[in-house]
């Protein structure tokens, strides 16, 4: 047993059939000696009297918010969750496996510069009774600061039959040096509460692992005169890392036709424009990449080339 | 060329073979996805790569105020990958695919780092962790790590020359 | 293409030494390590030992208990190895071969015999 | 050192038929990067052993289809689908895993 926070505890149990579960003892937080009695949440039964309750942890039904009272004055609560290990492994029942890039990858983050500034996110179809906590540093044995927002529902979706809920956090490096090779990465801790059940789950990265640029910003076309060719041209998204002559991007342009099945016509540059065909009813898309580390590619900034 | 007496070294030429690094060290080790190395117990030929740190002066202001900080310490580490991928660790079983860039990449590590420093002129370099061989089905770990780090390094030295070959070159 | 070619056939007396050399043609000699292998007459194959020709190291199998030393000359492209303190039992077909065994010498026999 | 214990020692065949040569290890070849630490060679008399497997299952360039290579991590198995008259010699597996490089005793492949 473990202390999440003030009066919150985690029982950890090895989720078994007839396991014996843990033996937990709780002490009234009282200077009061005699008659404290203990309850277990809205229930009215008395489950023991004295300054401390011993029990033994089991299953969900052991758990919950323990109560002494003295006199039908509460002294003190402490909330019990239940953290489940079967066959050697933490239950991870609170969040959907999201397979990206592998499989049982619950978190996923991205940054869209070397600010040290990240966003990570999560999926669940649970909707009610859920809460989140995220911490992160840098390193682990000896951490450096990284301060993270609270989580928020960040967007809802329908899947068939259910409906899928995404969290997100945004973090910040406390110290960030964009310039450095990073040498020690980023680990992310969430912990989920769902009812009376506590799970955890971790992450690790370094930044320029989940460097996503913004989309290319401001794309133009130019025709060229007597000819078929237009000049397309575009400029770095806002929120990449400056200078540019330093964080450099590369690109790739692709020309598309209507139909998902033409073939697709790619250009890659490191200039900010290109020089490309543009056939009827086709669209041009340019997207970024840092250019020289292979992270994400942006997503896609397009135009029509009518 | 870096001469003693810290004169600017050739940025266009260190820019065009830095990134041509960066494209090699990558075809010679593309993402490999399926494999976490930070989840394989770290060795300790990759815990003493040197690193380019915040202290080194290769950020945009540091080079502008002066750049021999920053490139003695990027030429300390070619010389550590050059090492490294001369070494039993890529040199020894298994065998690498018949078309690896490795070979391409050690040379122009060396390139790299003489462009850096000619014969004569001698900074400081790192000391070499210990070449002797480990047992050949550790290598492929170690040979993931190495070029991982190496992608890492090579990239923050590219951005060092393109960034030194669009405002510092004379 | 890949060659590695190795030095003519030595007969040899007990308690002599042998040095058989490998000139290798056709890739860059210091991007492999060279193997050492030995085929006594009518027997399987036995690993003699290895060297990484940037740097010379090696590595010996424990059974020739520093009879066998394994050297490269670099600018010739060249492994050699050599076997002292000679006896009857080292009579063998000596190959090198290329890091990943796709690449043998052909062979080099040493007869040792009083 | 580990050792590599070859069967049979001698395996007469019928132009066309199926062969199987067999090679336990002392120690497992399988390693935790998934790879199977193991070499099949095949030497003609008089000339030099070239390589037909690596890494337990995969062909050298230029071997013919009939050769493939399975197994487990100390239970190793070379098989020949259809054997051909230019298939006589004595194959040794050889593990790569650990030094010194160890190699079977060597199976005789000759026809019937």
């Known amino acids: 047993i473990w202390e999440l926070k003030k009066d919150v505890y985690v029982v950890e149990l090895d989720w078994y059939p007839d396991a014996p579960g843990e033996m937990v003892v709780l002490t009234c937080d009282t200077p009061e000696e005699d008659g404290i009695t203990w309850t277990l949440d809205q229930s009215s039964e008395v489950l023991g009297s004295g300054k401390t309750l011993t029990i033994q942890v089991k299953e969900f039904g052991d758990a919950g918010q323990y109560t002494c009272h003295k006199g039908g004055e509460v002294l003190s609560h402490s909330l019990l969750l239940l953290h489940k290990k079967e066959d050697g492994i933490w239950s991870t029942d609170i969040l959907k496996d999201q397979k990206e890039p592998k499989n049982k990858t619950f978190l996923r983050c991205e940054a869209k510069n070397y600010s040290g500034r990240f966003t990570c996110w999560w999926l669940t179809t649970i909707s009610t009774d859920l809460t989140f906590s995220v911490k992160s540093s840098r390193g682990s044995s000896d951490p450096q600061g990284v301060t993270c927002g609270a989580a928020t529902l960040s967007a809802e979706r329908v899947r068939g039959d259910n409906k899928e809920y995404e969290y997100s956090v945004e973090c910040q490096e406390d110290s960030a040096c964009p310039a450095a090779e990073e040498s020690l990465p980023i680990e992310v801790m969430v912990d989920a509460v769902h009812k009376l059940k506590y799970e955890n789950y971790t992450s690790s990265f370094f930044i320029r692992d989940i460097i996503k640029p913004d989309p290319p910003k401001n794309l133009q076309l130019k025709p060229l005169k007597n000819s078929r060719q237009v000049e397309v041209s575009w400029e770095y998204p806002d929120t990449w890392s400056t200078p540019h002559s330093y964080f450099s991007l590369t690109f790739c342009v692709q020309v598309q036709g209507k139909s998902k099945r033409e073939k697709k016509d790619r250009v890659f540059t490191d200039k900010t424009s290109a020089t490309v065909i543009c056939r009827k009813n086709a669209s041009i898309s340019v997207r970024a990449q840092d250019r020289y580390y292979s992270s994400s590619w942006s997503e896609w900034a397009s135009v029509p080339c009518s | 060329r870096a001469v003693p007496g810290g004169s600017s070294p050739a940025w266009t030429q260190c820019q065009q073979l830095s990134q041509k690094l960066c494209t090699l060290a990558w075809s010679a080790h593309p993402l490999v996805g399926h494999m976490d190395l930070r989840e394989e117990g770290d060795e300790e030929t990759t815990n003493d790569v040197p690193h380019i740190q915040c202290g080194d002066g290769c950020d945009p202001q540091g080079l502008r105020d002066n750049s021999q900080f920053c490139l003695q310490r990027i030429h300390q580490g070619l010389i550590f990958y050059e090492k490294l991928l001369g070494s039993d660790i890529f040199t020894g079983e298994p065998s690498l695919l018949p078309d690896s860039p490795v070979g391409q990449l050690h040379a122009s590590l060396l390139g790299l780092s003489q462009l850096l420093q000619p014969e004569g002129h001698h900074w400081e370099t790192q000391q070499i962790p210990s070449l002797s061989p480990s047992q050949p089905w550790q290598r492929l770990l170690l040979r993931f790590k190495i070029l991982r780090s190496l992608q890492a390094f090579v990239a923050v030295a590219a951005r060092v020359f393109a960034h030194g070959a669009a405002t510092l070159s004379p | 293409e890949f060659q590695l070619v190795q030095s003519g056939a030595e007969v040899k007396k007990p308690g002599a030494s042998v040095k058989v050399s490998c000139k290798a043609s056709?890739?860059?000699?210091?991007?492999?390590?060279m193997n050492w292998v030995r085929q006594a007459p009518g027997q399987s194959l036995e690993w003699m030992g290895v060297?990484?020709?940037?740097?010379?190291?090696?590595t010996y199998n424990q059974k020739f208990k520093g009879r066998v030393t394994i050297t490269v000359d670099q600018s010739a492209s060249t492994a050699y190895m050599e076997l002292s303190s000679l006896r009857s039992e080292d009579t063998a077909v000596y190959y090198c071969?290329?890091?990943?065994?796709?690449?043998w010498g052909q062979g080099t026999l040493v007869t040792v015999s009083s | 050192d580990i050792v590599m214990t070859q069967t049979p020692l001698s395996l007469p065949v019928t132009p066309g038929e199926p062969a199987s040569i067999s090679c336990r290890s002392s120690?497992?070849?399988?390693?935790?990067?998934?790879?199977?630490?193991l070499n099949w060679f095949l030497q003609k008399p008089g000339q030099s052993p070239q390589l037909l497997i690596y890494l337990m299952s995969t062909r050298a360039s230029g071997v013919p289809d009939r050769f493939s290579g399975s197994g487990s991590g100390t239970d190793l198995t070379l098989k020949i689908s259809r054997v051909e008259a230019e298939d006589v010699g004595v194959y040794y597996c050889?593990?790569?895993?650990?030094?010194?490089?160890?190699f079977g005793s060597g199976t005789k492949l000759e026809i019937k």
């Open positions: 056709g890739y860059s000699f210091t991007d492999h390590n």
């Open positions: 071969a290329r890091r990943g065994f796709a690449y």
């Open positions: 060297i990484n020709p940037n740097y010379g190291t090696t």
């Open positions: 050889q593990q790569i895993a650990e030094y010194p490089f160890t």
């Open positions: 120690k497992s070849l399988l390693y935790k990067d998934g790879k199977t630490y």
